[in-house]
């Protein structure tokens, strides 16, 4: 028995942030979950992770260096990444494994989500026009 | 209280195979994963790899992916290391330990240890 | 594969003497490095995780610092039960692996 999983299939970070929502066909309240988010069309970069459990607060956190964070809805985790760079464009799958009660579940692979990351725009603000160009 | 009780010492020939139990009580089996750590004599602890017991997942260190045999019987909440194809280099004390499977990256409760003797 | 080189591999130090041990990771493991004590014929014990977090019941004197590639364990007044072996281990990603270990003895 596999867990079904929503997701966007393309967000645009524009200021280097995004908020990915994850939405499952299971509901979390009480049960003890890690919910995880994969870089890359292998999955081979493990974003983020949130861990949650009935008796104490969800905990985020990032081994390899990214700024996120994560909200719990009864069926669903949002991911909140910030500091994205250009370069960190990429396919991005949620992952959600229950590991208490038994039996342990996970999901079906989902579709993932394209997030385009576009580079923080430096134009001139109209009331403080910047040097003019040739 | 939250244990690891491994089983007893064992002498074996070399060529010979091994296999090592770890019965875990006091926590929920399934939020950690086991780890397997060795120590030879006077020397450092060298991590041989891990088992998940919900989906028993693996995870080898290179150097025993060939030989180290990682299972788990949730049944009984024990977990266990084969070894096979024994050296005298494998003389080691070999130890499980736990790491949780939403916060994994320490080892916080260890076993008692095996001592596994490789001689002819 | 990510190696963990600590230093010294031993020291002498007396009751009472403040105590630097060092690891270097070969890349960058941003805070994911714990520090065991380990006496002879017993298991390790956890004493710091995640670089700088004490564990449960270890005492106050032991303290953790660094981030990236470069770690410090310190024992800020050595007592007689603190002689004994100390390692330092990545749990950033797999496989996971230790230090060479640092003997504490009894100067």
């Known amino acids: 028995n596999k867990i079904l999983v929503k997701q966007s299939p393309m967000l645009v970070a524009y200021d280097n942030a995004v908020n990915l929502s994850c939405k499952y066909s299971y509901n979390l309240f009480s049960r003890e979950f890690r919910a995880s988010l994969h870089k890359g069309l292998d999955s081979a970069v493990e974003v983020c992770v949130v861990y949650g459990n009935y008796s104490q607060q969800l905990q985020v956190y990032s081994k390899t260096g990214f700024n996120c964070d994560g909200k719990l809805g009864n069926e669903s985790v949002t991911f909140y990444l910030q500091n994205l760079y250009v370069n960190q464009t990429d396919i991005y799958f949620c992952k959600i494994e229950v590991m208490y009660p038994p039996p342990y579940l996970d999901n079906e692979k989902s579709n993932g989500t394209i997030i385009h990351v576009k580079g923080k725009h430096l134009c001139p603000s109209p009331l403080f026009p910047g040097p003019s160009k040739p | 209280q939250v244990q690891l009780v491994q089983s007893g010492a064992e002498v074996k020939k070399p060529g010979a195979s091994v296999k090592v139990s770890c019965k875990a009580s006091?926590?929920?089996?399934?939020?950690?994963?086991i780890h397997w750590v060795r120590q030879a004599p006077g020397q450092g602890l060298e991590w041989i790899g891990c088992i998940y017991p919900g989906n028993v997942n693996t995870n080898y260190n290179e150097k025993f992916k060939d030989r180290a045999t990682l299972t788990v019987d949730t049944s009984i909440s024990t977990a266990y290391m084969e070894l096979s194809r024994l050296r005298s280099d494998d003389t080691a004390v070999y130890f499980c330990t736990r790491s949780h499977y939403g916060l994994d990256w320490n080892f916080d409760v260890w076993g008692q240890g095996t001592t596994v003797t490789v001689s002819s | 594969d990510i190696q963990m080189t600590q230093s010294p591999s031993s020291l002498s130090a007396s009751v009472g003497d403040r105590v630097t041990i060092t690891c270097h990771a070969s890349?960058?493991?941003?805070?994911?490095l714990n520090w065991y004590q380990q006496k002879p014929g017993k298991a390790p014990k956890l004493l710091i995780y995640k670089a700088s977090n004490l564990h449960t019941g270890v005492p106050s004197r032991f303290s953790g610092s660094g981030s990236g590639t470069d770690f410090t364990l310190t024992i800020s007044s050595l007592q007689p039960e603190d002689f004994a072996t100390y390692y330092c281990?990545?749990?950033?990603?797999?496989?996971?692996?230790f230090g060479g270990g640092t003997k504490v003895e009894i100067k």
């Open positions: 281990q990545q749990g950033q990603t797999y496989p996971y692996c």
């Open positions: 006091g926590y929920t089996f399934t939020s950690y994963y």
């Open positions: 890349q960058n493991i941003y805070v994911w």
